[in-house]
Interface confidence: medium
């Protein structure tokens, strides 16, 4: 396997693209349980309807790979879990991709990403004891091709869930 | 250790204004959500409103929209309610919880009392 982009060994702030800029995706670091930092990125807007939160990646180098795999471990609240919380919660999120030739597009449109999955917690997950708390860690793998451009961007959409998404990491596998 | 101490709570008219802290220690605060619920006297627990991580995004009751708000300084590990216009049916016990985006455990204060009666 060859990693094309690992969010766990990024130094510093991730600085992904979060629209809308406030009230939606947040970059929020938390302790692992070496006292490490891990940049994550959170969301829980679970009492408004018709949440659409996106967080895009920096651009990532397909490095002539037909065929790439996503991995993304994250975390997903139960609605049930959360008090007063009413049918606006949801329990998916949504994983997008948009290839490009250009590493420093500023904007790009919703409709421009194509649809790789709709992402739900499953029954299996590890447990993470980060100090304070207990992160039930959910581990989802994507491929995505063929890809033609000489990169891509990610991106992840929110519609009202609870998540933090804790590494992300892409990744090839060499004939 | 962890704790979550409410303040501010009292009797007022109605009409009045209150405003709630809630002091958090023992955990990494600026990590989670904040949440005020309160419970009337009989009744179970009515979500009330949440601020997230950095305080830029809020959310209300229908019930409360307009006349509460919630605000954070992750300085202070501090979370606020400043409650106007105050209402005979606001009074209960209100009680702020913090909780993350994608782990527990949640975390609960002890509550403090509103009583808004003439």
């Known amino acids: 396997e060859v990693t094309l982009l690992d969010s766990r060994s990024v130094q510093g702030e991730l600085g992904w693209i979060a629209s809308p800029l406030e009230g939606g995706w947040e970059e929020v670091s938390i302790m692992d349980e070496k006292n490490t930092p891990i940049r994550t990125y959170q969301v829980c807007n679970v009492m408004e309807p018709s949440q659409n939160n996106w967080l895009r990646t920096d651009w990532i180098t397909r490095e002539g790979a037909q065929r790439v795999y996503i991995e993304i471990k994250f975390t997903l609240r139960d609605c049930n879990s959360l008090p007063g919380v009413m049918g606006t919660c949801k329990e998916t999120f949504n994983l997008y991709y948009y290839e490009s030739d250009n590493d420093k597009e500023r904007f790009i449109r919703e409709n421009q990403f194509v649809k790789i999955d709709t992402i739900a917690a499953d029954e299996s997950f590890t447990q993470v004891d980060i100090g304070d708390r207990i992160m039930k860690l959910n581990t989802e793998i994507r491929d995505v091709g063929p890809l033609s451009k000489k990169g891509f961007y990610l991106a992840f959409q929110d519609v009202g869930a609870c998540i933090a998404l804790v590494s992300v990491r892409v990744f090839y596998k060499k004939a | 250790q962890v704790q979550l101490q409410e303040s501010g709570g009292g009797l007022v008219q109605p009409g009045g204004s209150l405003r709630l802290s809630c002091a958090a220690s023992?955990?990494?605060?600026?990590?989670?959500?904040m949440y005020w619920v309160r419970q009337a006297p009989g009744k179970g627990l009515e979500w009330v409103s949440t601020i997230n991580t950095g305080g830029g995004s809020t959310n209300y009751a229908d019930s409360v929209k307009g006349r509460f708000i919630i605000s954070r300084d992750n300085a202070k590990n501090t979370v606020y309610l400043q409650m106007n216009s105050l209402k005979p049916e606001d009074t209960a016990v209100y009680y702020c919880?913090?909780?993350?985006?994608?782990?527990?455990?949640?975390?609960w204060g002890q509550g403090t009392q509103v009583t808004v009666s003439s």
């Open positions: 919880n913090a909780f993350a985006a994608g782990w527990g455990p949640d975390y």
């Open positions: 023992g955990f990494t605060f600026s990590s989670y959500y």
